[in-house]
């Protein structure tokens, strides 16, 4: 806490500029008007303030806006955002995607901090759902964002937003999350033709039921082994040898390398040896 002291003569700040970097902490507290700071927040990032000086500026904004900063200030916080606590951020009402982008840019290249997580939560709750533009922005900054959400939170993702999802965004999703996302993806991509549909739906297939895998097997999709290995075991088990052969296409020979791993192992054990022998891979049920 900086002690309240009168501003020395001639030091009263008329604008936020580089001369302020030479001010001691107490001088910043005494000589910089909080309202001036709020209107010229965009200048703060261009000035090499020390962490201690930034603490003073934050304190001034906190005093001016005890109920939480307005968006006009939040949008220009820049590196001052790193000084905010989750408790500070919970007071904010962030509605502009531009504001969100500006603050995510500050944290770019780092793990998602509690501050960023709180900011995103506030933003999404304010919007009511994860729309396409928001999802596009969040996954661009944090590819694992989608998989950090609970199945309940994912249920608020509208099918239209699925178009923004890239394969790498789903890398860390577990089966429960894919169970929620797959039906949305199926709906989102339903008007695409066979091969284009498969390219888009492939990353979500960890949530696909048996009947959808059977349907895909009739479409010359040539599913690769990496995708097959991520399918739900309960969805794979009812597939026949012929269906798996058609589903995998040329990739079917990769079953031999994966015969000890799930879901391949469990699937092999469910098949008749005569049927497995038709593959010519030497798979033993």
């Amino acid at each position: 806490e900086v002690e309240k002291t009168a501003c020395p003569s001639g030091k009263k700040a008329r604008e936020i500029d580089e001369s302020l970097i030479f001010y001691k902490k107490w001088e910043l507290e005494a000589c910089v008007d909080a309202a001036l700071l709020a209107t010229q927040m965009d200048r703060v990032n261009a000035i090499p303030f020390t962490y201690e000086q930034l603490d003073v500026l934050k304190h001034k904004l906190d005093e001016l806006y005890p109920q939480g900063y307005p968006e006009s200030v939040i949008q220009h916080l820049g590196y001052l955002f790193l000084k905010m606590s989750p408790e500070d951020i919970r007071k904010w009402n962030v509605t502009s995607l531009e504001t969100l982008k500006a603050l995510l840019e500050v944290n770019k290249g780092h793990e998602m901090s509690p501050q960023v997580a709180t900011l995103i939560d506030r933003f999404v709750k304010g919007r009511g759902q994860l729309d396409k533009d928001t999802l596009d922005t969040l996954t661009a900054f944090y590819p694992g964002y989608l998989c950090s959400l609970s199945p309940e939170e994912l249920s608020s993702v509208p099918p239209s937003s699925i178009w923004a999802v890239r394969p790498q965004d789903l890398d860390t999703c577990d089966p429960r999350q894919l169970d929620v996302l797959y039906p949305k993806a199926r709906l989102a991509f339903q008007n695409m033709n066979g091969s284009e549909y498969f390219v888009k739906i492939q990353s979500f297939l960890g949530g696909a039921p048996t009947e959808d895998l059977k349907a895909l097997s009739q479409q010359n999709v040539s599913m690769d082994l990496a995708t097959f290995m991520k399918l739900r075991t309960d969805a794979v088990l009812p597939l026949t040898v012929a269906e798996v052969q058609k589903l995998l296409g040329p990739h079917v020979e990769g079953l031999k390398a994966e015969e000890r791993h799930r879901p391949v192992r469990d699937w092999i054990l469910r098949q008749r040896q005569d049927d497995l022998d038709t593959l010519g891979l030497g798979l033993q049920g």
């Epitope: 040539s222 690769d224 082994l225 052969q245 296409g249 040329p250 990739h251 020979e253 990769g254 031999k256 390398a257 994966e258 593959l279 010519g280 891979l281 030497g282």
Partner: antibody, heavy 115, light 108 residues
Framework: EVQLVESGGGLVQPGGSLRLSCAAS????????IHWVRQAPGKGLEWVAS????????SYADSVKGRFTISADTSKNTAYLQMNSLRAEDTAVYYC????????WGQGTLVTVSS | DIQMTQSPSSLSASVGDRVTITCRAS??????VAWYQQKPGKAPKLLIY???SLYSGVPSRFSGSRSGTDFTLTISSLQPEDFATYYC??????????FGQGTKVEIK
């Protein structure tokens, strides 16, 4: 994206040796068979050799048996074709391909055996 | 080793024609037969695998069938980009592979 890139071709004298490489990306060669196929100038396709790393299986065409050796380094995701005692009739573009149903092929590397 | 005898070695056809190429195996074989298309200076491209399965992304005018030891590639309506050389190939897993001699499809 799946890609196969051959290298190591060139001009060699009869009786000489060459080692061709097939660098794979976008998939794991451990769980895939890799094949070498050659094509002499103006001629058709001729299978040369196959390897399945996961089952330690190798196979050769009669025309190269005892002279060529196929191998794979799964840590480098690369397959090789060591060609010894080369003959004029081995002159060809050499392709590597993935799977028995060869869904991806490299661009090919030219091997010329001539004195 | 199994031989694959491909016929004809060349044929002339017009755009829109139905084209059929046949490969006969020298002995009983499994359905592990594939068909490839190759254009000059390029690597072959897979069209059909397992005798009759259309490879992903290949136009549906291409089809494959089997009758005993005879394997057939059919192009239902020849397109300008289909003029090329076609090869059949047999090779069940863990067996030697053999290619047919090739069929060159030329413009009439």
């Amino acid at each position: 994206e799946v890609q196969l890139v051959e290298s190591g071709g060139g001009l060699v004298q009869p009786g000489g040796s060459l080692r061709l490489s097939c660098a794979a990306s976008g998939f794991n060669i451990y769980s895939s068979s890799i094949h070498w196929v050659r094509q002499a100038p103006g001629k058709g396709l001729e299978w040369v050799a196959s390897i399945s790393s996961y089952s330690s299986y190798t196979s050769y065409a009669d025309s190269v048996k005892g002279r060529f050796t196929i191998s794979a380094d799964t840590s480098k995701n690369t397959a090789y074709l060591q060609m010894n005692s080369l003959r004029a009739e081995d002159t060809a573009v050499y392709y590597c391909a993935r799977y028995y149903a060869m869904d991806y092929w490299g661009q090919g590397t030219l091997v010329t055996v001539s004195s | 080793d199994i031989q694959m005898t491909q016929s004809p070695s060349s044929l002339s056809a017009s755009v829109g024609d139905r084209v059929t190429i046949t490969c006969r195996a020298s002995q009983s074989v499994s359905s592990a037969v594939a068909w490839y298309q190759q254009k000059p200076g390029k690597a072959p491209k897979l069209l059909i695998y397992s005798a009759s399965s259309l490879y992903s992304g290949v136009p549906s005018r291409f089809s494959g069938s089997r009758s005993g030891t005879d394997f057939t590639l059919t192009i239902s309506s020849l397109q300008p980009e289909d003029f090329a050389t076609y090869y059949c190939q047999q090779g069940p897993y863990y067996h030697p592979i053999t290619f047919g001699q090739g069929t060159k499809v030329e413009i009439k």
